[in-house]
């Protein structure tokens, strides 16, 4: 039985050229996190493996920084970065939990953060 929930930063916005932290948190479960995958659509951004550490996809190696924690910092944002991002938690024995973040990259100098929300 999967009892955990993923809390994410929800819908967020950031300025073009700036950076943003993508963050998820798994709670309400004692399952062991073995790996967290960060994806945009079906495209890999990065993996944080409990034993092996971080692997950054070639497509993002010049502008993704690991962390903080299991999160991901996306730098030098462009409008093409607008879209859905997923944190996929591989856990034992529960299985896989997925959280969703929607990022909007704005041309303007005003970028407001959305509210946090949960995905069971």
């Amino acid at each position: 039985m999967m009892t955990g929930t993923i809390e994410t930063t929800g819908n967020i916005s950031a300025e073009k050229g700036g950076s943003i932290i993508l963050q998820c948190h798994l709670s309400s479960t004692t399952a062991q996190v073995t790996q967290v995958n960060w994806e945009q659509q079906d495209q890999l951004l990065a993996i944080c493996n409990a034993d092996l550490g971080w692997h950054i996809s070639p497509s993002f190696k010049d502008r993704v920084a690991p962390g903080p924690g299991l999160g991901l910092t996306l730098q030098s944002l462009t409008v093409n970065d607008t879209g859905e991002y997923f944190c996929i938690y591989h856990t034992y024995p529960d299985g896989t939990y997925t959280g969703r973040i929607f990022l909007e990259v704005l041309e303007s100098s005003v970028a407001e953060h959305g509210a946090r929300f949960q995905i069971p």
Epitope: I47, H55, K61, D62
Partner: antibody, heavy 120, light 107 residues
Framework: QVQLQQSGGELMKPGASVKISCKAT????????IEWVKQRPGHGLEWIGE????????YYNEKFKGKATFTADKSSNTAYMQLSSLTSEDSAVYYC?????????????WGQGTTLTVSS | DIQMTQTTSSLSASLGDRVTISCSAS??????LNWYQQKPDGTVKLLIY???SLHSGVPSRFSGSGSGTDYSLTISNLEPEDIATYYC?????????FGGGTKLEIK
């Protein structure tokens, strides 16, 4: 020493599916990506995609989505690639290769290749 | 996708020669380039990664250089076992793509 041993050549009929294997020895199987590469005469080498055997995380070249499916069996240190709905365009030599986990973006050891012939 | 072009598909040289194989990318790839050797029997080996780093066990007569869109592999003193096809591959972003290969033959 690191070795990748691939299954033998296959002669398949159009429309069928085939599963090619790649057995890894000489290193910790779960800790490295297995890459799959296609080689057709006159078409050079084409990257199909990759799987991280420890978690089963797999990523595909857009061109091969729906055609190739990767799996891995940690108990036998073997990676598999299934190709479906075969056509003559799938006739090729297929290679598996190793890419170390982390920021190592090169295929440092290769299998000997598996020749697939699709013919009615 | 980034296109990798090896304009010379085949090259003939004499033993002891210095041979240079070139590769160009359709856009800048920031030195994110590898070179592989494929022997006539199909065996593939990594030679050079990140433009100029020699993979372990590869003879020092192999070297790589380049920047931006243009890269090259040099064999300083051609030996019989170097008869093979050589491929460049970028890893600037996915999908990885390879050049069409340069087949090296002995005169």
């Amino acid at each position: 020493q690191v070795q990748l041993q691939q299954s033998g050549g296959e002669l398949m009929k159009p429309g069928a599916s085939v599963k090619i294997s790649c057995k890894a020895t000489g290193y910790t199987f779960s800790n490295c990506w297995i890459e799959w590469v296609k080689q057709r005469p006159g078409h050079g080498l084409e990257w199909i995609g990759e799987i991280l055997p420890g978690s089963g995380s797999a990523y595909y070249n857009e061109k091969f989505k729906g055609k190739a499916t990767f799996t891995a069996d940690k108990s036998s240190n073997t990676a598999y690639m299934q190709l479906s709905s075969l056509t003559s365009e799938d006739s090729a030599v297929y290679y598996c290769a190793r890419q170390k986990y982390g920021n190592y973006y090169y295929f440092d050891y290769w299998g000997q290749g598996t020749t697939l012939t699709v013919s009615s | 996708d980034i296109q990798m072009t090896q304009t010379t598909s085949s090259l003939s040289a004499s033993l002891g020669d210095r041979v240079t194989i070139s590769c160009s990318a359709s856009q800048g790839i920031s030195n994110y380039l590898n070179w592989y050797q494929q022997k006539p029997d199909g065996t593939v080996k990594l030679l050079i990664y990140y433009t100029s780093s020699l993979h372990s066990g590869v003879p020092s007569r192999f070297s790589g250089s380049g920047s931006g869109t243009d890269y090259s592999l040099t064999i300083s003193n051609l030996e019989p076992e170097d008869i093979a096809t050589y491929y460049c591959q970028h890893y600037s972003k996915l999908p990885y793509t390879f050049g069409g290969g340069t087949k090296l033959e002995i005169k």
